[in-house]
Structure formats: structure tokens, C-alpha cells
């Protein structure tokens, strides 16, 4: 291929041609097609959908489309032995049982293979005991219970409301508190927006609706039986006792009708404050156990789910780059759903499908991107990001040498208020520039840019006139690319005006009511928000794959590094005496950040001035930009989390969904006042400052002139 091939035809087929080819009507059609039956990971239906997508991507014009299969640990309810929770009297008789399934939505009554609500990877068991209400089961909730209220959860079954943090963290916290079972429920305070009707008449959660979800604590490991390596035909698998991240106590989710029956009888301590009260007409007593009249009654869980090694299928499509075929820009989102996947994931998969179609159309007219674009339809995301992680493990050597960027494409919407973006600082300027060129779909912003409506509705807390862009956490398929491999990553979707409820999801999340009709009737009837998300995701991929100089600005990393250093120093300053006693200094970190800032500034100047017609110098500068994210990777990983290797960002140890900056230092400082050996604890803080300072300095040096 001639090195001019891409640029010769770019004027005719530029970003505008790509964006103009994206059509809302197509996204709507694709969403309908993808949501008529369940596509649970490991099922025949999801395999058939993989083959359909493979076939359609080939028709759209990709150079190759392959299935990549792996045999991973999944979890399913026992079809003949259903899971449920009972209230039992002193004779052991079941006087109340929770429902065995969600009432199906209208039009779906005869659909087979709707998996009943369950907590994936729960062990089997039938524990019985007194109930303790633990609010959201966050770290701070258990601190409140154990330290302030002196309530012991040991040997108790705890009931926690969904929301605020990833459910796996709730289960981990309950296990550490000594609980013998966990009941998860959706409280209307978190999953029922005031003034909106329940599905099918609105987008709120009905009382019989239940959120499914995995309860693993994988910390980036992928398949629990093959951490670090692909689950291929010759894999060595750990025994189940050595599997990564499996919960040790039974867990089950319920809706708020059933939760009402359990919570209304609660006795013991009153809730410590109003933040522990939801919206049910119950006292929200903490327990333990039921009140007076019901004090002899207990709660019993009946969990019979099984863990099974099952085949999963990713679809991997390739559009070869004309100039730099060995540089990969990846657009990936998952295909597997809990039930119909109306929002999660198919609102994202439909957008990816339309992006592939648009790229394919351009390719059929003779265009190619400068760099290779890989498109991925991941399997088993809902079971722990398994498809993406196994594929990245299998291809890690290629990815770490050739990976330019990863753009995630799960749910396109979680609301219809404004844009939400989480990405590496390297992509801030790309996102700003792109959204300035796109039209806002928002009412009241006709003729205005997406940047303008986004900035107005979601302003940056630090920089006036700019929109908020958040840190990447986890809970989605970018995890392995960013947190393990250090590939610059980003994600974008339309969201709600509900900042306080950031991590609770939309009301019908992971329920049977997440249907095509939910989207078409209530969220996005014109599919204009889907189209905007397609333009943002697709536009980012286009620019990353096609711009001559990579659209990364290393100066934005300098800005956030200073902010993060200041934040972590401020946390440490809450212990001034200990800092003095143990000679804890952040000077090395601030020095490294200062050096990074100066070197990044000089690099940016050189980037403006160098001879872009010299392919060797161009490639050299682009490689420095590509490898900057990689330079933040510590090959040893974070303490006890070897697959979280990014020193600047990691998923919070207390909430997988949230990103934490300087996570090594943060975790070393967390609750340090309670550590039994303060000298050792502060020694670890000092070690983590050293690791962070070294890493920032080392990253800075990758931007220095090469010789």
C-alpha cells in the first residue's frame, strides 16, 4: 500500500462524510433487531447473534470479521430448583416467600429463556438467621454499624439497598463483616424517580422488578479460573477453591415489594440518621432481627445456582489502515445481556453497528483510515468483563506495542439530559474539539453545538466554560485496555440530570423491563440522542485512526497530575503529626509533576514545529504520544491487585465503578488511623509516594527529546 493512499482520498471522504452517513433510523432498526429475545452470555441465542453480527459486518465491508471463543466460568440459576428467600417461623415453616420471577412486560409473556433474577456467582447455600439492614453496604456504612452503633453482623443475614457502589463491593464488605448471607434490593428512593410512572407506563421500576448482576471481586482478572492468561483450548484452570474473586456467602436480589415484607418487621436499633432511610413505608430499623411480635421469626435464603465453564464468543472486525496498519484504534462494546438488553448493552451495540456500516460505506468507495480500526462485540461482560479481558490477554503483546486507543461502547443512554464522558486526559482536547463541531440534540439548544449544551448542563467544577469530564473507573470493557495495558481509553453516553445518583444506574437497569419499547417510548423516540452518541464515539474513532498527528495533548495530563497530587497531599495532611513523626514528604511527587509539566510543554512546542512530511519523525512523535499512557503502567501492579497496573488511575477499592487517582497512595492512607502498626502503615504510604513519583518522572522522560 502506498503511504499516500489514505491521504489521497481523504478530502472526498473526510470526517463529515463519515458523520453524515450515520442515521438515527438505522440505529433504531438495529436496536429492535438486537432486543427481541434474550442474549444471555453462554447461550445459543447469543452465539447466533454473534454469527449474525459477523455476517453483517462482512456485508458492511470490513476486511475481516472473526469469532474469538473462550471457555470461561459463568453462573446460572438451577432451572428446576429456584432461588428464593423466606421468612420462617419458630417451627421452620415458610410464612412468606419472595417471588421466583419478574412479571413479564406486555408483549413478552410468551418469550422463553428469561433468566430469573439472581446474583451471578453466588455460592449455593441455605443460611438462616436474623436480618441486619446495612444501608448501601458501603465501607462507611459498615464503619457506622460496627464502630459507632456497635452492631455485629457476624452470623447475620444482611439486607442492603442497591446503589451508590458496585454490588460486588457490597458483598465483599458484608463478607468482611462476618455476614452469612446478603439480600440486595432496589429501594424506590434510588430506582423510582418522583412524578414518573412504573413500566410499562413510564420508565420507573415496578415493585416486582429486580436488578440482576454479578457479585465478583475480580480486580481485573477476567475469567476467574485463568487469571492473566486466555481461557483457550489448552488453558490450565484453577480449582474452584482457588478461583479469583468468587463470593463465599449466598447472595440474592429482590424487588421493593418483597423488600417491604422483610423490612417492615425489622426491630433493634433505629436508623442512625436520615441518610439510612429509603422511600418505603418501613421504619428502616437496623436490627438485628425482627421487632417484638415477630422476634422468633427468621430469614432463610435458598440459593441453588451453579458455576459452569461455558463457551463465549467475541466478534472481532478489522478495517486495515492504509498508512500505519500496525497501529490499532479499537471500538468495542458488549453484546451479551441479562434479558432483552434494551439499554444495556444493545443501545450501544446498535450504535457500533451503525458506525461499522458508515466506515464500511466509505471503504467501499475507496477510502481507508490511516491506522487500523478494530471493532469488537464482546461477550460475557455482565459476568465480569470476561470476553474483552480474555481477548486482551490473548493479544496482549500486540496490544501493548500497537494499541493507540480504545473507545468503549456499552449503553448509549442512561438518560436523555446531557452528554457524559469519562476518558484519559490525553483525550480531553479531542473530545472538546469534536463536540464543538457536532450539533446539540437538546431541546432549547437548536443550532447550538453539543459542546455548548454539555457545558451548560454539566459544567466542569474546576474550569469555567468547560464541560465536566470524569475519571475512568471500571465496571465496563475498557478496564483491561486502560487499567492493565495502559492504552488511552474513553467512553461517552447520554445521561440523566441526577448527579447525586451517579452510580445507581437508571431505574430499570438489568431488569426484564429493559426493552426496545422502554427506549422507543420513553427515552429517545427520535433516536436523536443515540445518533449524537454515535457521532461522538464514531468521531473519536475517526480522528484517532485518521489524524496525521495523534489527537492527544500531554499538557492536559500535566494539569490533572498536579490536581491529583494536591488532592492526595490534602488527604495526608489530615494526619500532620504522623507526617512529621514518620518524615512523610510529598516533595518527590510534586517535583516529578513539575518536571512532567515542563517536559510536556516543551514536547507540545516541538509537536507544533516538526516536519510532518518526514514519516520517520512523524512516527517517532506519534509513538511518544501513544506510549505515554503506557508509561504510567507499573509492571508489578497495585498492592493485592496485580491486574490494576495504572499508577495514576484505578477503580476505587470501595466502588469498582468509580475511578481513584494515585490509588496506591490513597489506599495506603485510607483508614490509616485504625491500623495496628502505624509505623508500618506510614512506611507503606512513603513507599507508594516513591512509586508514584518515580512513575510520573519516568513518564515525563518518555516525552523528552529522544537523543
Amino acid at each position: 500500500k502506498s503511504s499516500n493512499e489514505a491521504t489521497n482520498i481523504t478530502p472526498k471522504h473526510n470526517m463529515k462524510a463519515f458523520l453524515d452517513e450515520l442515521k438515527a433510523e438505522n440505529i433504531k432498526k438495529f436496536l429492535y433487531n438486537f432486543t427481541q429475545i434474550p442474549h444471555l452470555a453462554g447461550t445459543e441465542q447469543n452465539f447466533q447473534l454473534a454469527k449474525q453480527i459477523q455476517s453483517q459486518w462482512k456485508e458492511f465491508g470490513l476486511d475481516s470479521v472473526e469469532l474469538a471463543h473462550y471457555d470461561v466460568l459463568l453462573s446460572y440459576p438451577n432451572k428446576t430448583h429456584p432461588n428464593y428467600i423466606s421468612i420462617i417461623n419458630e417451627d421452620g415453616n415458610e410464612i412468606f416467600n419472595t417471588s421466583l420471577f419478574e412479571p413479564p412486560p406486555p408483549g413478552y409473556e410468551n418469550v422463553s429463556d428469561i433468566v430469573p433474577p439472581f446474583s451471578a456467582f453466588s455460592p449455593q447455600g441455605m443460611p438462616e438467621g436474623d436480618l441486619v439492614y446495612v444501608n448501601y453496604a458501603r465501607t462507611e456504612d459498615f464503619f457506622k454499624l460496627e464502630r459507632d452503633m456497635k452492631i455485629n453482623c457476624s452470623g447475620k443475614i444482611v439486607i442492603a439497598r442497591y446503589g451508590k457502589v458496585f454490588r460486588g463491593n457490597k458483598v465483599k464488605n458484608a463478607q468482611l463483616a462476618g455476614a452469612k448471607g446478603v439480600i440486595l434490593y432496589s429501594d424506590p428512593a434510588d430506582y423510582f424517580a418522583p412524578g414518573v410512572k412504573s413500566y410499562p407506563d413510564g420508565w420507573n421500576l415496578p415493585g416486582g422488578g429486580v436488578q440482576r448482576g454479578n457479585i465478583l471481586n475480580l480486580n481485573g482478572a477476567g475469567d476467574p479460573l485463568t487469571p492473566g492468561y486466555p481461557a483457550n483450548e489448552y488453558a490450565y484452570r484453577r480449582g474452584i477453591a482457588e478461583a479469583v474473586g468468587l463470593p463465599s456467602i449466598p447472595v440474592h436480589p429482590i424487588g421493593y415489594y418483597d423488600a417491604q415484607k422483610l423490612l417492615e418487621k425489622m426491630g433493634g436499633s433505629a436508623p442512625p440518621d436520615s441518610s439510612w432511610r429509603g422511600s418505603l413505608k418501613v421504619p428502616y430499623n437496623v436490627g438485628p432481627g425482627f421487632t417484638g411480635n415477630f422476634s422468633t421469626q427468621k430469614v432463610k435464603m435458598h440459593i441453588h445456582s451453579t458455576n459452569e465453564v461455558t463457551r463465549i464468543y467475541n466478534v472481532i472486525g478489522t478495517l486495515r489502515g492504509a498508512v500505519e496498519p500496525d497501529r490499532y484504534v479499537i471500538l468495542g462494546g458488549h453484546r451479551d445481556s441479562w434479558v432483552f438488553g434494551g439499554i444495556d448493552p444493545q443501545s450501544g451495540a446498535a450504535v457500533v453497528h451503525e458506525i461499522v456500516r458508515s466506515f464500511g460505506t466509505l471503504k467501499k468507495e475507496g477510502w481507508r483510515p490511516r491506522r487500523t480500526i478494530l471493532f469488537a462485540s464482546w461477550d460475557a461482560e455482565e459476568f465480569g468483563l470476561l470476553g474483552s479481558t480474555e481477548w486482551a490477554e490473548e493479544n496482549s503483546r500486540l496490544l501493548q506495542e500497537r494499541g493507540v486507543a480504545y473507545i468503549n461502547a456499552d449503553s448509549s443512554i442512561e438518560g436523555n439530559y446531557t452528554l457524559r464522558v469519562d476518558c484519559t486526559p490525553l483525550m480531553y482536547s479531542l473530545v472538546h474539539n469534536l463536540t464543538k463541531e457536532l450539533k446539540s440534540p437538546d431541546e432549547g439548544f437548536e443550532g447550538k453545538s453539543l459542546y455548548e449544551s454539555w457545558t451548560k448542563k454539566s459544567p466542569s467544577p474546576e474550569f469555567s466554560g468547560m464541560p465536566r469530564i470524569s475519571k475512568l473507573g471500571s465496571g465496563n470493557d475498557f478496564e483491561v485496555f486502560f487499567q492493565r495495558l495502559g492504552i488511552a481509553s474513553g467512553r461517552a453516553r447520554y445521561t440523566k440530570n441526577w448527579e447525586t445518583n451517579k452510580f445507581s444506574g437508571y431505574p430499570l437497569y438489568h431488569s426484564v423491563y429493559e426493552t426496545y419499547e422502554l427506549v422507543e417510548k420513553f427515552y429517545d423516540p427520535m433516536f436523536k440522542y443515540h445518533l449524537t452518541v454515535a457521532q461522538v464515539r464514531g468521531g473519536m474513532v475517526f480522528e484517532l485512526a485518521n489524524s496525521i498527528v495523534l489527537p492527544f495533548d500531554c499538557r492536559d495530563y500535566a494539569v490533572v497530575l498536579r490536581k491529583y497530587a494536591d488532592k492526595i497531599y490534602s488527604i495526608s495532611m489530615k494526619h500532620p503529626q504522623e507526617m512529621k513523626t514518620y518524615s512523610v514528604s510529598f516533595d518527590s511527587l510534586f517535583s516529578a509533576v513539575k518536571n512532567f509539566t515542563e517536559i510536556a510543554s516543551k514536547f507540545s512546542e516541538r509537536l507544533q514545529d516538526f516536519d510532518k512530511s518526514n514519516p520517520i519523525v512523524l512516527r517517532m512523535m506519534n509513538d511518544q504520544l501513544m506510549f505515554l499512557e503506557r508509561a504510567f503502567i507499573d509492571p508489578l501492579g497495585l498492592p493485592d491487585r496485580p491486574f490494576y497496573r495504572h499508577v495514576i488511575y484505578a477503580p476505587s477499592s470501595h466502588n469498582k465503578y468509580a475511578g481513584e487517582s494515585f490509588p496506591g497512595i490513597y489506599d495506603a492512607l485510607f483508614d490509616i488511623e485504625s491500623k495496628v502498626d502505624p509505623s508500618k502503615a506510614w512506611g507503606e504510604v512513603k513507599r507508594q509516594i516513591y512509586v508514584a513519583a518515580f512513575t510520573v518522572q519516568a513518564a515525563a522522560e518518555t516525552l523528552s527529546e529522544v537523543a
Partner: nanobody
């Protein structure tokens, strides 16, 4: 010379108020968080409050929450601590701590003594 100078300390009765100031010279602190730290006689250092760089967010030790308010005026390079409903246990030397935008080491003031006594 880069320095922070606290003022506003003194002797005050329980229940009364004081306002501490911390003026920066040779120093621009708008880029960083600023902190108040105190040391009671014969005791170790104790963190009191932090105000983050844009002034929109602040944090306090539990014992002063609802009584003390930290604020900053970046144009005047000055940090404040409004102390209301003072108690005997608030008696201490109060230090402000900051970081100049170009410096890598934190800067501590010399402190101002607050005595709460009837």
C-alpha cells in the same frame, strides 16, 4: 521570600468568635489546596480544615464541623478561618499550610496562638 503569615489570634471567652487570616507573600497559592493545622499546648499537630483550589469544596475535622468556616480570597492571596462558638479545647497555635504554584515543598506559617478561656 516565600512565606505565610497568620494573624487574628488572641484570648477569647468560650462561645465567642475569632477570625484568623493567613497572608501569603512572594507566593501564589491559587493553584493548590490550603490547610489549617493546630497544636494544643503539649499535644501533637492536628488537622483542622482544608479548602480546595477553586474554593468550592472544603473539609473539616469532626470536632469543629458546624463551628468553623474556611475561606480564601485568591485575589488577595489570603486564607481565612472563621471560628464561632469557641471552646476551651480549641486553645492551640493555629498554622496555615500551603504550596506555592512553582514550589515543590509545602510552606508553613509561624502560627498564631488562640486561647479560649473564661
Amino acid at each position: 521570600e516565600v512565606q505565610l503569615v497568620e494573624s487574628g489570634g488572641g484570648v477569647v471567652q468560650p462561645g465567642r468568635s475569632l477570625r484568623l487570616s493567613c497572608a501569603a507573600s512572594g507566593f501564589t497559592f491559587s493553584s493548590y489546596a490550603m490547610h489549617w493545622v493546630r497544636q494544643a499546648p503539649g499535644k501533637g499537630l492536628e488537622w483542622v480544615a482544608t479548602i480546595y483550589q477553586d474554593g468550592s469544596e472544603s473539609e473539616y475535622v469532626d470536632s469543629v464541623k458546624g463551628r468553623f468556616t474556611v475561606s480564601r480570597d485568591d485575589a488577595k492571596n489570603t486564607l481565612y478561618l472563621q471560628m464561632d462558638s469557641l471552646r476551651a479545647e480549641d486553645t492551640a497555635t493555629y498554622y496555615c499550610v500551603g504550596r506555592d504554584s512553582t514550589s515543590i515543598t509545602p510552606v508553613w506559617g509561624l502560627g498564631t496562638l488562640v486561647t479560649v478561656s473564661s
